[in-house]
């Protein structure tokens, strides 16, 4: 906290400009009017303030708006957003998608921080629903955001948003979420040819039904064991030995190492021993 001191003669700021970077912290506190700062927030980002100076500017805004900043200020926070705590952000009412984009842009390239998570939560609650534009924006910045949504919330995700999703972004999705996402991915990628389609759909297959797995087995996709192990057990159980062999291609040998783990274990128990023997892997049903 900067102690209160009188502004030296001739140093009172009449506008937010680059001369302020040469002010000491106490001079900023004494010489910059908070209301002036609020109306000229858009200038702050163009000026190379030190982070200590940004702390002073934030303090001035906090004093001016103890109940939370208005959206006109929030939209122009820029770097100053990265000085905000989740507690600060919980006081905000963010309704404009432009404001959300502006702040997400500041954090671009970094993991989703607690501040960003709080901002998104405030925004979605303020809007009352996850509309297409909001989801397009959020998945563009954070494709992994999908896995933080409930299956009910995911039901409103437009298939077009699926294109932004990378395989690693689905790592934290559970089967219930993939059940919702898979049909959307299938729709999104439906016009791709076989091999390209499989590359795109692969990470969503944890939500695929039996009939789709049967269809894939006819396309020489050579699914790897890691993908196979993430398939729904109830979707794998009805597959025949021949279908699994076609589905996995050269990776079928990996079944032996996974014979004690679901879904392989349960699938083996459903097969006739004669059929399993055709694989030549020594699998015991």
């Amino acid at each position: 906290e900067v102690e209160k001191t009188a502004c030296p003669s001739g140093k009172k700021a009449r506008e937010i400009d680059e001369s302020l970077i040469f002010y000491k912290k106490w001079e900023l506190e004494a010489c910059v009017d908070a209301a002036l700062l609020a109306t000229q927030m858009d200038r702050v980002n163009a000026i190379p303030f030190t982070y200590e100076q940004l702390d002073v500017l934030k303090h001035k805004l906090d004093e001016l708006y103890p109940q939370g900043y208005p959206e006109s200020v929030i939209q122009h926070l820029g770097y100053l957003f990265l000085k905000m705590s989740p507690e600060d952000i919980r006081k905000w009412n963010v309704t404009s998608l432009e404001t959300l984009k502006a702040l997400l842009e500041v954090n671009k390239g970094h993991e989703m921080s607690p501040q960003v998570a709080t901002l998104i939560d405030r925004f979605v609650k303020g809007r009352g629903q996850l509309d297409k534009d909001t989801l397009d924006t959020l998945t563009a910045f954070y494709p992994g955001y999908l896995c933080s949504l409930s299956p009910e919330e995911l039901s409103s995700v437009p298939p077009s948003s699926i294109w932004a999703v990378r395989p690693q972004d689905l790592d934290t999705c559970d089967p219930r979420q993939l059940d919702v996402l898979y049909p959307k991915a299938r729709l999104a990628f439906q016009n791709m040819n076989g091999s390209e389609y499989f590359v795109k759909i692969q990470s969503f297959l944890g939500g695929a039904p039996t009939e789709d797995l049967k269809a894939l087995s006819q396309q020489n996709v050579s699914m790897d064991l890691a993908t196979f192990m993430k398939l729904r057990t109830d979707a794998v159980l009805p597959l025949t030995v021949a279908e699994v062999q076609k589905l996995l291609g050269p990776h079928v040998e990996g079944l032996k190492a996974e014979e004690r783990h679901r879904p392989v274990r349960d699938w083996i128990l459903r097969q006739r021993q004669d059929d399993l023997d055709t694989l030549g892997l020594g699998l015991q049903g």
Epitope: E18, A46, P48, T50, Y51, L54, Y79, L82, K83, V106, N107, G109, H110, E111, S113, P114, Q115, V116
Partner: nanobody
């Protein structure tokens, strides 16, 4: 993570020149702001010059305007401070600092500082 190492300090007579360098180990991005600060014995640290990398806009304290020049060589990832017409009052430890949009695990801004290089102006 960015590491900054200053060099080029030393003892120099009034009216002479020195060139300080600040080598950065990481990439200096377009969103970075680079600063030269100085701290004289028993005095508060003060900002001498700054540069906004993306816009290559330069800023100078009144006390050094016309004498000092800040510059950045992106290919070498090095910040410079050319100091001409040095005066006794320029004696200080000079630090370079980098402010980019780099954040810690909690999403808060990080800045990076060098260890400083001593400049003594004396006859």
């Amino acid at each position: 993570q960015v590491q900054l190492v200053e060099s080029g300090g030393g003892v120099v007579q009034p009216g002479r020149s020195l060139r300080l360098s600040c080598a950065a180990s990481g990439t200096i991005s377009d969103t970075s702001r680079m600063h030269w600060f100085r701290q004289a014995p028993g005095k508060e640290r003060e900002l001498v010059a700054a540069i906004s990398v993306g816009t290559t806009t330069y800023y100078y304290a009144d006390s050094v305007k016309g004498r000092f020049t800040i510059s950045l060589d992106n290919s070498k990832n090095t910040l410079y401070l050319q100091m001409n017409s040095l005066r006794a009052e320029d004696t200080a430890v000079y630090y370079c600092a980098a402010y980019g949009v780099d954040v810690d695990v909690n999403g808060y801004l990080l800045d990076y500082w060098g260890q400083g290089t001593l400049v003594t102006v004396s006859s």
